[in-house]
């Protein structure tokens, strides 16, 4: 039995290079540990951007990753990626694993296309 | 016999609010006048953004429209929309009409999703 993972198809990063989007899964299971991984797809290659494990007590994740943050609530993770630049424009996939207790479930979203535009530099102040 | 109009599926506006994209049609006909209309689709409604008629002599268009400009070369129009803000994010369709001489042909592209991010204001200089 697979879980369905849904995420928005498109997100625009702010002018500060911050993109936020939800990653939800269903059906909701009574799970002690949920692992969420953000992957970037370029051509046929997947690169891990960041990963974290959420628990009932630990609902704030990605503490080891300076570019990612996230909060967990029931079957929804609110993901934020920061420090993005135009070269980071691409498809970001959310992978969800229900780690414990068994049975183990895994699901992958179709990806969120994140568009990033580099801001123009502000003029120097005289 | 219809003409096929092609345009990119996605374009990002620059931080200055400028989006440029090509609109091409085929097959190419020996046409004295080609009318190009840019439409914005919101829900089921189409709104005309700008329109112009290109001729062999008049290859620069949209002179009456402050937000649009375009150049025509054979069966390709290079469109530029400026003054865009985040609220203008949406689907922009290119409509091409071969106006004269007959036969009249018309075609519509599938639309270009233009994403616009408002820039952060620069800090006041002291």
């Amino acid at each position: 039995e697979a879980i369905q993972v849904t995420q928005p198809s498109v997100v625009l990063a702010s002018s500060h290079g911050v993109a936020s989007f939800p990653c939800e899964y269903s059906p909701s299971h009574n799970t002690d540990e949920v692992r969420v991984t953000v992957l970037r797809q370029t051509n046929d290659q997947m690169t891990e951007v960041c990963a974290t494990t959420f628990t009932e007590k630990n609902t704030v994740g990605f503490l080891d990753y300076p570019f990612c943050s996230g909060t967990f609530n029931e079957s929804r993770v609110n993901l934020t990626i920061q420090g993005l630049r135009a070269v980071d424009t691409g498809l970001y996939l959310c992978k969800v694993e229900l780690m414990y207790p068994p049975p183990y479930f895994v699901g992958m979203g179709n990806g969120t296309q994140i568009y990033v535009i580099d801001p123009e530099p502000c003029p120097d102040s005289d | 016999e219809a003409i096929q109009v092609t345009q990119p599926s996605v374009v990002l506006a620059s931080s200055h609010g400028v989006a440029s994209f090509p609109c091409e049609y085929s097959p190419s006909h020996n046409t004295d006048e080609v009318r190009v209309t840019v439409l914005r689709q919101t829900n089921d409604q189409m709104t005309e953004v700008c329109a112009t008629t290109f001729t062999e002599k008049n290859t620069v268009g949209f002179l009456d429209y402050p937000f649009c400009s375009g150049t025509f070369n054979e069966s390709r129009v290079n469109l530029t929309i400026q003054g865009l803000r985040a609220v203008d994010t949406g689907l922009y369709l290119c409509k091409v009409e071969l106006m004269y001489p007959p036969p009249y042909f018309v075609g519509m592209g599938n639309g270009t999703q233009i994403y616009v991010i408002d820039p952060e204001p620069c800090p006041d200089s002291d």
């Epitope: - | 006048e33 106006m99 004269y100 007959p102 036969p103 009249y104 018309v106 075609g107």
Partner: antibody, heavy 124, light 107 residues
């Protein structure tokens, strides 16, 4: 009601000139390509000249090229045909006709509205 | 220019008869063939466009068929008000050209 009304026909000597007018109503004239089609007595239909909606492009049948000039005044919803160096073989009923351009149809190739015609007779 | 040849040039039929007119193009014009009706002293009127499409308001006894170079126009049951000259017109290549016309009379 969509309507086209021609005027300006009459009797003229060979080598003379005449100007035909066609007043349009009931549709967006400036968006419509307009044409002149003639019919000699007891004969068939012959396309003569056409003009684009903007007035920027024109075309002529070989038989009238260099002698006839088509024009339009979109502010007056009127089509014109200036006929110079007229010949006996130009004798005909001259019809103005609208060439239909419809987005729904993708391609069109017919005249959907015609005026009642005006007779031009070239004779000495 | 594309030449259009219509036949017959004239015909006489009785009320209720089926009437058929043919039109041949000098080259392939796909389905870009239109038919007009012209009553004496009147302007032409579009009846059929693109070979087989009936113009709005035209009675269903009129029909058209064909593609390529050979086309047919049919009046399924001739009525007195159908006395007129019928013209075909090609719309494939500019300039448009017309057939020489077929005059339809009642016996």
């Amino acid at each position: 009601e969509v309507q086209l009304v021609e005027s300006g026909g009459g009797l003229v000597q060979p080598g003379g000139s005449l100007r035909l007018s066609c007043a349009a109503s009931g549709f967006t004239f400036s968006s419509s390509s307009m044409h002149w089609v003639r019919q000699a007595p007891g004969k068939g239909l012959e396309w003569v000249s056409g003009i684009s909606g903007s007035g920027g492009s024109t075309s002529y049948a070989d038989s009238v090229k260099g002698r006839f000039t088509i024009s339009r005044d979109n502010s007056k919803n009127t089509l014109y045909l200036q006929m110079n160096s007229l010949r006996a073989e130009d004798t005909a009923v001259y019809y103005c006709a609208r060439y239909l351009m419809s987005f729904n149809l993708v391609r069109t190739s017919w005249f959907d509205v015609w005026g009642q015609g005006t007779l031009v007779t070239v004779s000495s | 220019d594309i030449q259009m040849t219509q036949s017959p040039s004239s015909l006489s039929a009785s009320v209720g008869d089926r009437v058929t007119i043919t039109c041949q193009a000098s080259q392939d014009i796909s389905n870009y063939l239109n038919w007009y009706q012209q009553k004496p002293g009147k302007a032409p009127k579009l009846l059929i466009y693109d070979a087989s499409n009936l113009e709005t308001g035209v009675p269903s006894r009129f029909s058209g068929s064909g593609s390529g170079t050979d086309f047919t126009f049919t009046i399924s049951s001739l009525q007195p008000e159908d006395i007129a000259t019928y013209y075909c017109q090609q719309g494939d290549a500019w300039p448009w050209t017309f057939g020489q016309g077929t005059k339809v009379e009642i016996k």
